[in-house]
C-alpha cells in the first residue's frame, strides 16, 4: 500500500496504484529513440539498443517502431502511455508480454509498430505471423 508518509496526491499528479492499493512501480524498456537498423526480412530482431530505462510513469509500456523507406531502415524504442496515441496510432496490444509487430498504413514508407508490458519486452521485436493473433488459423487453434 502507499506508505503513509508519502504524499498521496498533489496538483492532480496522482500516485498510481494497482487494484490492491499498492504503489504501481514502472517497468523497464529499451529507450534509444530513433536509431538506424539492419533489421529487415527477418521473423524477429533484437533492438541492439544498449539503454534500458525506467519508464517515467508507472502506466507506461514499451513501444517499438520499425520504419523502412527508400533511404534507410530505422528502429525506435521508447516508453509511452497507452492511453495516448503514438505516431497517431492507438497502442492496441499494450497488455501483451511480447512485442508483436503490426503493419500500419503510412504513405511513402513501410511502418510497423508494437507495444508490450513486460520488462525490456521491446528488445525483441517479432514480425513472424505465427505470433500474430490476427491470423485466423491461430485464433482457431486458441479457441478450440
Amino acid at each position: 500500500t502507499i506508505p503513509p508518509h508519502v504524499q498521496k496526491s498533489v496538483n492532480n499528479d496522482m500516485i498510481v496504484t494497482d487494484n490492491n492499493g499498492a504503489v504501481k512501480f514502472p517497468q523497464l524498456c529499451k529507450f534509444c529513440d530513433v536509431r538506424f537498423s539492419t533489421c529487415d526480412n527477418q521473423k524477429s530482431c533484437m533492438s541492439n539498443c544498449s539503454i534500458t530505462s525506467i519508464c517515467e510513469k508507472p502506466q507506461e509500456v514499451c513501444v517499438a517502431v520499425w520504419r523502412k523507406n527508400d533511404e534507410n531502415i530505422t528502429l525506435e524504442t521508447v516508453c509511452h502511455d497507452p492511453k495516448l496515441p503514438y505516431h497517431d496510432f492507438i497502442l492496441e496490444d499494450a497488455a501483451s508480454p511480447k512485442c508483436i509487430m503490426k503493419e500500419k498504413k503510412k504513405p511513402g514508407e513501410t511502418f510497423f509498430m508494437c507495444s508490450c508490458s513486460s520488462d525490456e519486452c521491446n528488445d525483441n521485436i517479432i514480425f513472424s505471423e505465427e505470433y500474430n493473433t490476427s491470423n485466423p488459423d491461430l485464433l482457431l487453434v486458441i479457441f478450440q
Epitope: 494497482d18 490492491n20 499498492a22 504503489v23 512501480f25 523497464l28 525506467i54
Partner: nanobody, 122 residues
Framework: EVQLLESGGGLVQPGGSLRLSCAAS???????QMWWVRQAPGKGLEFIS?????????YYANSVRGRFTISRDNSKNTLYLQMNSLRAEDTAVYYC???????????????WGQGTLVTVSS
C-alpha cells in the same frame, strides 16, 4: 520487522554532490530488488533507480542517467545513491524501497523508508 532508514540528505549547491545511504534490517538484504524513488514538492513519485539481486544489474530513469549511481553493500545491508552534478530540479524527498514478488503473478510486496530531504539551491 522490515526497516529501511535513509540518511545523507541536506542542502547542496547546484553542480554539487551528495551520497545517500539506506540502512536495511529485518530481511535478507542481499536477495532483494531495491529502488530509489523521489518526490519533488507538489509532484508525484519518480522512480529513479533500481538495482537487482543477484547480479547487481542497475537501471536508471532518463532524468538521472549519467549523473546518479546506485550501488549496494550486502555485507553492510546498505543501499547507496551517489548523486553528482545536482540541479535545482533534483530537490525532493528521496525514499529507498524494496520490492518482492508475492508468488501471485504480477503482484508484489513493497516496503518504504521514511525518506531524506535533498535541497539543491544556491
Amino acid at each position: 520487522e522490515v526497516q529501511l532508514l535513509e540518511s545523507g540528505g541536506g542542502l547542496v549547491q547546484p553542480g554539487g554532490s551528495l551520497r545517500l545511504s539506506c540502512a536495511a534490517s529485518g530481511f535478507t538484504f542481499g536477495t532483494e530488488q531495491m529502488w530509489w524513488v523521489r518526490q519533488a514538492p507538489g509532484k508525484g513519485l519518480e522512480f529513479i533507480s533500481r538495482i537487482d539481486s543477484p547480479g547487481g544489474r542497475t537501471y536508471y530513469a532518463n532524468s538521472v542517467r549519467g549523473r546518479f549511481t546506485i550501488s549496494r553493500d550486502n555485507s553492510k545491508n546498505t543501499l547507496y545513491l551517489q548523486m553528482n552534478s545536482l540541479r535545482a530540479e533534483d530537490t525532493a524527498v528521496y525514499y529507498c524501497a524494496k520490492r518482492r514478488p508475492t508468488g501471485v503473478s504480477g503482484t508484489f510486496y513493497d516496503y518504504w523508508g521514511q525518506g531524506t530531504l535533498v535541497t539543491v539551491s544556491s
